[in-house]
Amino acid sequence: SPEVWVQVQMEATNLSSFSVHCGVLGYSLISLVTVSCEGFVDAGRTKLAVLHPEFGTQQWAPARQAHWETPNSVSVTLTMGQSKARSSLANTTFCCEFVTFPHGSRVACRDLHRSDPGLSAPTPALNLQAD
């Protein structure tokens, strides 16, 4: 069964810009990836980007760019006001859902203010670093 991982990379010099990276490990056919967050813009879950293998990508503010980084992983870059970023990040959870065949939907989340690895599948330790 495939494992999903989530990671957040922040620019050391620019707190208003950061990126969410997520991917799936194992042998599976990816049919759709959805990246979302909770507690960032409002109380509910906000869809940041949807990436389809063939038809391309779609993103919504504050996501600025979404793209495939490898056949098994994606990246979503987010930009917002620096003060908003500082105050919001502490309470934000980023989630990535991979719809794969034959395994179905797999979700992993990264909660920025807790040390647990997230939901559903193991994720590596959080790695905050400069670009």
Epitope: W5, Q7, Q9, H21, G23, L25, Y27, S28, L29, I30, P53, E54, F55, G56, T57, H67, W68, E69, T70, P71, N72, S73, S75, P124, N127
Partner: antibody
Framework: QVQLVQSGAEVKKPGSSVKVSCKAS????????ISWVRQAPGQGLEWMGG????????NYAQKFQGRVTITADESTSTAYMELSSLRSEDTAVYYC????????????????WGQGTLVTVSS | DIQMTQSPSSLSASVGDRVTITCRAS??????LNWYQQKPGKAPKLLIY???SLQSGVPSRFSGSGSGTDFTLTISSLQPEDFATYYC????????FGGGTKVEIK
């Protein structure tokens, strides 16, 4: 222009391990996957596995699962491939290559490639 | 794993000939198919990606077509520097290479 430079040729005994390095220069390292491909003498190309340096996560071909470990060191922009329990059939040229793609779709391919590292397994 | 079968495994041709190499996937891979050229003692070189897109710097006599399970690499007019081994590669689920096709001088 990204370049991949691999470590030199190795001669190993059966049952031992070999670790081959692949140093990237001239581009971003962390957010491009590096794959390892081998080619036995007179044979075809075999994908062994690949790593995404930013997360440290690796995928492996089923054939090599449990015997190969691919790692990456972001500080030196270097990827490593370690193959254990070597046998004579592991004698091959080992290549590293960068997964390159369009970004907006899931199309990826290998470009550029390292120059190759010959690993000879002999008693 | 997805298996990639190339045919023929070798062929003899003359300069100026039209050469066609086929690659068949064991299951549908959409257009996730790349072609490489390899010369003895050298690393492979990318020719075609995404089934039909010509890599920058590759001569236009090379072309690729197909989708699903059946793919073709065509060299419209074989040149002396084209004698080499050609490999297809799927990138739909991880990666797998075909067995290769050696193009030799007749």
């Amino acid at each position: 222009q990204v370049q991949l430079v691999q470590s030199g040729a190795e001669v190993k005994k059966p049952g031992s391990s070999v670790k081959v390095s692949c140093k990237a220069s001239g581009g971003t390292f962390a957010t491009y996957a590096i794959s390892w491909v081998r080619q036995a003498p007179g044979q075809g190309l075999e994908w062994m596995g690949g790593i995404f340096p930013l997360s440290g996560t690796a995928n492996y071909a089923q054939k090599f699962q449990g015997r190969v470990t691919i790692t990456a060191d972001e500080s030196t922009s270097t990827a490593y491939m370690e193959l254990s329990s070597l046998r004579s059939e592991d004698t091959a040229v080992y290549y590293c290559a960068r997964d390159t793609g369009r970004g907006y779709t899931r199309h990826f391919w290998f470009d550029p490639w390292g120059q190759g590292t010959l690993v000879t397994v002999s008693s | 794993d997805i298996q990639m079968t190339q045919s023929p495994s070798s062929l003899s041709a003359s300069v100026g000939d039209r050469v066609t190499i086929t690659c068949r996937a064991s299951q549908s891979i959409s257009s996730y198919l790349n072609w490489y050229q390899q010369k003895p003692g050298k690393a492979p070189k990318l020719l075609i990606y995404a089934a039909s897109s010509l890599q920058s710097g590759v001569p236009s006599r090379f072309s690729g077509s197909g989708s699903g399970t059946d793919f073709t690499l065509t060299i419209s007019s074989l040149q002396p520097e084209d004698f080499a081994t050609y490999y297809c590669q799927q990138s739909d689920i991880l990666y797998t290479f075909g067995g290769g096709t050696k193009v030799e001088i007749k």
